[in-house]
Structure formats: C-alpha cells, structure tokens
Interface confidence: low
C-alpha cells in the first residue's frame, strides 16, 4: 500500500484528455502553489508536488536539473493528480539531491515550478 | 487528530442563499484541497467543486456554475460554501471533504421550501 | 462528463459471504477510482482509492480491483457491520464524478 500523504496528495493520473471546442472557449493555466524545497534524510522518501489547475487540463512534465526525469520501477514515479503532479523518491541516495522542475501545458500556454532536494 | 465540522442545518426560502462553512483541526488548511459533495435526500453523491485554501482557486462542477462561491478566511481554518437562487431540489446534506476524501465533515442539512 | 454506473443496484446477502460489485466507467479513467461505504444517516467513508490501494484502517477483507473502464470491490467474507451502500468515484476528469451506489442488504 502507497503511504498516503497528508499534503495534496494521492488523486491521481490526467493522460488522454478528449480537448473539445467547449473546452478550449475559456483555457487557462495557474500554477496554484509554488514547489517547496525539501530538505531530508538517506534512505528517506522525498514528495514534490506540482499543483496547477488548467482547462483542459494540462500535461505535466518532470526535469532533474534540466534533464527529463526517468521513472525507476519502485523508486522513482511520479503521477498526475487532480491537483497536478506528484513526484516521489523512495530510498533517498546523495545522487538524487538537485533541482526539480515541473512544466505545465495546456497546449496554449505554459507554468513552471521548480523544488530543490538537498 | 484530523477533525472538519461544519455549520449547523438551515431552512431557506427558494431563491435565497445558503452558506456553509467548514472549519478544519489537526492539519493544515492550506496546503490541502478542500471538496464539496451534496446529498440530496436518499439520492446519491454528487461533487460540486473545490477550494484551494492557499490562495483562493476554485474548481466548479459545471452544474453550479454562476450559483455556488467557495471561500476560506485562512486566519480561522475554515472554507465556506454558499449557493445562491437556491431551488427544492438544491434541499440535501452538504458536505466539505479534504483533498482526498479521506476525512469529511459531518454534513450540514440545508432545507429550501416556501 | 464521465458516468459512472453501477451493478447492482441493490443486492441481499448473508454474513459470511462473499459480495462482488462492479463500476463501469462511460471512458477510460485509468486507476483514478475510489471506493466508499456509506451507512444510513453517516458520513462516506473512503475504503480504496487508486482503485486497488486499501486506505488506512480498512479491513483487509475489502478489495478493489480494474482498471481502464471495468473497476471491482470485492468483501471476501461479508461482516455485520458491512451492510450499507457503496460509491464509486472517478476522478479523471472534471467533474467528479460518482456512481449512484449500490445497497447491501441482509439476506
């Protein structure tokens, strides 16, 4: 079972979204809250959560240090929420540690937010 | 302990406004999303939108839109829900739920009748 | 919008046995399902979420299974106290939407 989290939390994926003329009459995109900074231990679980509201809903994006970041079976996933998206680390190593950045489309216009983990 | 309660049952006229309010313990309202779901009488759930208590953003079921509010004054942890041009079928048990509906308000019953 | 169906609508069982309900989605909604349990004149009580992940304090007797547009939650051994009716929710989409429930009743 997932640990559940007492922040924003686990509502989850928003892949293929049917984009209608209906929707696309009032788009926007808001970045809700800016991505804390976490500060934590090896051997640790770390969360960043990017919270964005978008119509039609945005596609979210995960960069380490610029660089797009790769989901590890069991260690590291991140999932869209309805709230945006939810990136967890399991297992902390001194190599995880950097700049985490989400990237929010809605296909119009573009919101990003970045964490640093250290 | 995690803890929301809600305002006490009211009876409005048609037409009126109602407003509920939600106050929350033992977490932190504003880094939590708060729902609200309806229950009319006997029926089911039916989700009418949220609050994000950080800064005031809302998301509406389409169904209220331009009828229902949702407000929080962050100094008092509490979100508030008001519907307005309220109908007999708006009569139902509201409930404020937080981000994942793990934990619900104990409901308020607002009665709309002439 | 999403709907969301349920089947049955209503259903008689006895203490001991095995209850099945389904949810079927009108589109695909991933694993963004939750499962609750509502009894007369309580609170909903969230049960499953992620379609298959049991929430804290849950008895390991429920379960929930699917993903896509079929979703399952399984009592294997009914209990007294698990008589009452059951949502499901998607949230894959806005709005959220709930299916209408089914009621467990005492055979």
């Known amino acids: 079972q997932e640990t559940e989290l007492s922040v924003s939390a686990e509502l989850v994926p928003t892949s293929s979204w049917n984009i209608s003329s209906e929707l696309n009459k009032d788009s926007y995109l808001t970045l809700d809250e800016p991505m804390n900074n976490i500060t934590t231990s090896l051997g640790q679980t770390a969360e960043l959560h990017c919270k964005v509201s978008g119509n039609p809903p945005p596609t979210i994006r995960w960069f380490k240090n610029d660089a797009p970041v790769v989901q590890e079976p069991r260690r590291l996933s991140f999932r869209s929420t309805i709230y945006g998206s939810r990136l967890r680390i399991r297992n902390l190593d001194t190599t995880d540690t950097g700049y985490f950045q989400c990237v929010a489309t809605n296909g119009k216009e573009v919101v990003s937010s970045t964490g640093v983990l250290f | 302990q995690v803890q929301l309660v809600q305002s006490g049952a009211e009876v409005k006229k048609p037409g009126a406004s109602v407003k509920v309010s939600c106050k929350a313990s033992?977490?932190?309202?504003?880094?939590?999303?708060m729902h609200w779901v309806r229950q009319a009488p006997g029926q089911g759930l039916e989700w009418m939108g949220w609050i994000y208590p950080g800064n005031g953003n809302t998301k509406f079921n389409h169904k209220f839109d331009g009828r229902v509010t949702m407000t929080r004054d962050t100094s008092i942890s509490t979100a508030y829900m008001e519907l307005s041009r309220l109908r007999s079928d708006d009569t139902a048990v509201y409930y404020c739920?937080?981000?994942?509906?793990?934990?619900w308000g104990q409901g308020t019953l607002v009665t709309v009748s002439s | 919008d999403i709907q969301m169906t349920q089947s049955p609508s209503a259903m008689s069982a006895s203490v001991g046995d095995r209850v099945t309900i389904t949810c079927q989605a009108s589109q695909d909604i991933g694993n963004n399902l939750i499962w609750f349990q509502q009894k007369p004149g309580k609170v909903p009580k969230r049960l499953i979420y992620f379609a298959t992940s049991l929430a804290n304090g849950v008895p390991s007797r429920f379960s929930g299974s699917g993903s896509g547009t079929e979703f399952t939650l399984t009592i294997s051994s009914l209990q007294p106290e698990d008589f009452a009716t059951y949502y499901c929710?998607?949230?894959?989409?806005?709005?959220?939407?709930f299916g209408p429930g089914t009621k467990v009743d005492i055979k």
């Open positions: 929710l998607q949230y894959r989409e806005y709005p959220l939407t």
């Open positions: 739920a937080r981000s994942d509906f793990d934990y």
């Open positions: 033992g977490y932190t309202l504003t880094t939590n999303y």
